[in-house]
Every structure is written in structure tokens, then in C-alpha cells.
């Protein structure tokens, strides 16, 4: 329960806080658990204790191990354990899972990525930020205090973000890097596979030869503003514009509506002066978005005009 995992890279600074808390006036003793050897407090040592903090300036792979901290007060002692692992620097860009701090989620409204563990260090702004090992450039990215702000967050902003800063100890500078994953969630709504409400799959629509007919393709795509969603008609698997029959036209623009809070689109296909050959065509209502594409097919059948003779 009072054990904490800490990790760092060789030749970087690593500062670890004792998992057991106490008042600043309480003394904290640190030991290397394997040997029970006391950690010195003199700052001239590469590894030294400073109250609740254990400092590796800089860290070495051989420093890996379990460290014991004992918080001493006049009335009690509290013991904690810091499990420290120092890794060799990776030669390639890949940041392994074991070097990752907790994943954070962001959205269009809230896109702060905090630099992990930075509050333990003596650092000065600005922080440097990298995404998937590339330095972040452009006005959308703003390094602010101990966090990164991304303006107009998009799904493409998801990835691994590394912050890099300098820890200063008695005039000496040490580099520190920390990486965490960032995922993007849409606060406004969500996106689904298209759900075609009309027409029904393999619907047969009765039409009168010589009269006009309308077919409506209607589909819903999720909640809130939808990015890249469309409904359209095809004739025998061909775009209406490419089919080359001027009597058959798609309504210009798509009508947007909201059904039970869902964002829906509809597109009307207008057939002027229905002819016999129109009954042989396959009419496909297509609904598509980033998730995918769904199609419902309609065919026309002849509706016999009502006999008005007495």
C-alpha cells in the first residue's frame, strides 16, 4: 500500500517522493533496501536524500532497486517504499509502455496535457513538448506553465506526448523527460455507423408512369455536430451526376434534422415523368461517414392508375 513505482532514464535527473507523508518538520531517513545502507544527505553525492525527496542527479541503471523511507516524528515512525527503475535511453523514437505515465483525455473544450512529476523538480519555463518524438510547432500548441494546451483539438491529436525540461540543483543543470498518451474524446457528441431510417432495405416503391416520383434517403450518424457525414443516391451503382439522365436529379444540398437528439441527413431523389425503363434501375440510398458506408436498395414498380370511369 505504501509502495510507489518510479522510473527514469539514465543520465537524466530523477526525483522520488516518499510515499508516506508527514509534516515538513518531521525527519525522513532513506535507505537502500537491499543493503540497508543509509542514503547520504550531502548534496555533493550523485544520489542523496533531501527530506521527503530522494534525488538521482543524474540517474544510472545501477540505481534501480527498492528504497525505504522512514518518516520519524516524536510519537511514531512511518515506513514507505520507492521501487525505482532506471532504463537505458532508447535509440529509436518508440517510447515503451513501461516509460509511460497515465493516459489523459482531452476534448475540444479541454485540452490540457500536464507534464508528469514536474512539481518535484526545480525548473524554469518554457517546457519543450514533443509528439511521437517530433517537436511541436504551430500556433495551435501553447506551452503554458507545467502543461501543454492544444487549440481546436482533433482526433489526429491523439498520441504520445513528451515534455522535456531542465532541473537545476545548485547551479548544475540536468535534463528530464516524461511521456504520456493523450486521447481525444468528443464532448459535444459522438459518431456512429450510419443508420438508414428510410427507405427500408429492398423496398419496392409504386410509381405511376408519366407522373413524377420522389424518393427520400434519410440516415442518422450520431449525436452533435458530425464531421464528414453524407447521404446520396446512386443509380445502378453510379453517381446521379455521372448517370446522365436529366429527368432524374438529386435535390441540391442535404437537409439536416435532429431526431431524438441524433444528427440526421436526408436527400431527395426526384424522378420527372417516370418511364418504363426507370423500373429496371436499382436505386441505392447511401449513407456514409468516417466509420463506414451503408446502403439500402429501392426498386420501382408500376402502380396502375385508378379507373375513374363510371
Amino acid at each position: 500500500k505504501f509502495s510507489k513505482q518510479s522510473w527514469g532514464l539514465e543520465n537524466e535527473a530523477l526525483i522520488v517522493r516518499c510515499p508516506r507523508q508527514g509534516k515538513p518538520s518531521y525527519t525522513v531517513d532513506w535507505y537502500y533496501s537491499q543493503t540497508n545502507k543509509s542514503i547520504p544527505t550531502q548534496e555533493r553525492n550523485r544520489v542523496f536524500a533531501s527530506g521527503q525527496l530522494l534525488k538521482f542527479l543524474p540517474a544510472a541503471v545501477a540505481d534501480s532497486g527498492i528504497y525505504t523511507c522512514i518518516v520519524r516524528s516524536p510519537t511514531f515512525n512511518r515506513t514507505g517504499y520507492a521501487n525505482v527503475t532506471i532504463y537505458k535511453k532508447q535509440s529509436d523514437c518508440n517510447v515503451p509502455d513501461y516509460l509511460m505515465y497515465s493516459t489523459v483525455s482531452g476534448s475540444e473544450k479541454n485540452s490540457k496535457i500536464y507534464c508528469p512529476t514536474i512539481d518535484l523538480y526545480n525548473w524554469t519555463a518554457p517546457l519543450e513538448w514533443f509528439k511521437n518524438c517530433q517537436a511541436l510547432q504551430g500556433s495551435r500548441y501553447r506551452a503554458h506553465k507545467s502543461f501543454l494546451v492544444i487549440d481546436n483539438v482533433m482526433t489526429e491529436d491523439a498520441g504520445d506526448y513528451t515534455c522535456k525540461f531542465i532541473h537545476n540543483e545548485n547551479g548544475a543543470n540536468y535534463s528530464v523527460t516524461a511521456t504520456r498518451s493523450f486521447t481525444v474524446k468528443d464532448e459535444q457528441g459522438f459518431s456512429l455507423f450510419p443508420v438508414i431510417g428510410a427507405p427500408a432495405q429492398n423496398e419496392i416503391k409504386e410509381v405511376e408512369i408519366g407522373k413524377n416520383a420522389n424518393l427520400t434517403c434519410s440516415a442518422c450518424f450520431g449525436k452533435g455536430t458530425q464531421f464528414l457525414a453524407a447521404v446520396l443516391w446512386q443509380l445502378n451503382g453510379t453517381k446521379i451526376t455521372d448517370f446522365g439522365e436529366p429527368r432524374i436529379q438529386q435535390e441540391e444540398g442535404q437537409n439536416q434534422s435532429f431526431s431524438n437528439g441524433l444528427a440526421c441527413l436526408d436527400m431527395v431523389l426526384r424522378i420527372a415523368d417516370v418511364k418504363e425503363e426507370d423500373l429496371l434501375l436499382q436505386y441505392d440510398c447511401l449513407a456514409l461517414n468516417l466509420h463506414g458506408l451503408r446502403r439500402h436498395t429501392v426498386r420501382l414498380s408500376r402502380k396502375n392508375p385508378i379507373d375513374h370511369h363510371s
Epitope: L228, G237, T238, H291, G292, L293, R295
Partner: antibody
Framework: QVQLVQSGAEVKKPGSSVKVSCKAS????????MHWVRQAPGQGLEWMGG????????NYAQKFQGRVTITADESTSTAYMELSSLRSEDTAVYYC?????????????WGQGTMVTVSS | DIQMTQSPSSLSASVGDRVTITCRAS??????LNWYQQKPGKAPKLLIY???SLQSGVPSRFSGSGSGTDFTLTISSLQPEDFATYYC?????????FGGGTKVEIK
Amino acid sequence: QVQLVQSGAEVKKPGSSVKVSCKASGYTFTNYYMHWVRQAPGQGLEWMGGIIPIFGTANYAQKFQGRVTITADESTSTAYMELSSLRSEDTAVYYCARGGYYDSSQFDIWGQGTMVTVSS
Amino acid sequence: DIQMTQSPSSLSASVGDRVTITCRASQSISSYLNWYQQKPGKAPKLLIYAASSLQSGVPSRFSGSGSGTDFTLTISSLQPEDFATYYCQQSYSTPLTFGGGTKVEIK
């Protein structure tokens, strides 16, 4: 007949990128979604993402977001999948698969697969 | 993400046997479930789509059933060419996810 023909096997170094192609024939390329699915040796199937050529915009599984790029060239009826920052765990057979006509989330036609080996 | 769990992971059967493979989704996926067959060194092949519809060209001994979270693939009379690995796949939402597979071996 309808078929998807993929590019040949690749051997890559960790940290590098690979681009696999998938040439479609026998159907109207723009009318169908194209998916990419991978299968590590002795393992199951894993969806990476896909693209609707008439949109030209891809959808990726979160796991691959930022590392994978799927594109489509209508003029040659070819889809491409590029995976960057390769690691040994990316060693797998990579398949392109056509989405179904009525529902693009079914994989009705598959390419023969491209073996990508990542090794130092 | 929707998790798909297949059982059993492998089974041994004889030619002529009736074989049943089950697939469970971590949440309701209506009838958005597909089944695939894969033979060693080959690409998967679509057998059943929308839980129960037989893909064109697939023998009628294959059938699918179920909706919501529980689905079944049945081979009514196992043939020599049916020894393969079978995967279920949900097509309800992205990321599209597969079950771990069921290997059907000769007893």
C-alpha cells in the same frame, strides 16, 4: 472477377516505415470501403482502419492513430497502408479487405496478404 | 471498444459431426455480427453476415444465429474442407473487433 492484389513481402528495421499497396480490380473501386487488417504470427485478426475512396478520408483504430496512414488512389484503383515507427511487435501479415456493398463493416473480399517482418 | 469472446478456443471433431461455436459481445450489438473461416497461410473468407445471412457461394451446412450479445455458428455436418480457424467480428461500431478464433481440428 473481383480481386485485391497486394504488394510483396517486406523486411524492415525498427523505427522505419513500410507502405503496402492493394490493387483492386473487377469492381467500381470508389463504391466500396477498403479496410486494413493485420495478423501477427499465430495470432488473431486486428482491424487497423479503413477508407472510403469517394471521401478520401480514413478512420483508424485508436491503437494505430498517429502511426498509420491509409490512402486511396482512384485513378489506379489502389489503396495504400503506411505504418511508421515500426517495432518488432508489428511483424505480421497485413491484409486489405473490401467492405461489403450494403454494409462496409463486413469484409467480403480479401487480398492475399503481405508479410512484414520487423527485425534489427 | 467492444470485446468479442469466442468459445471454445479449439475443438476436435470428426467428418459428419455437428459443430457449434459461440461468440459473446461485451455489449449489445443487435445483429451486427459476421463469421469468417481461415485456413493456414490463406486470407479469411466471409461465411455469415448480419448474424444469420449466408454469404453467396457458402455451403448451406453453415448457419448463424443470435442477436444482442450471444451468437452461434453451426456447421450441420462437418466436411474435410471445414477444418480451419473460425472468427467472429462485430460490425456495430468502430474499432471493428474480432473474437480470438476457434480452431476446428480433426479428431
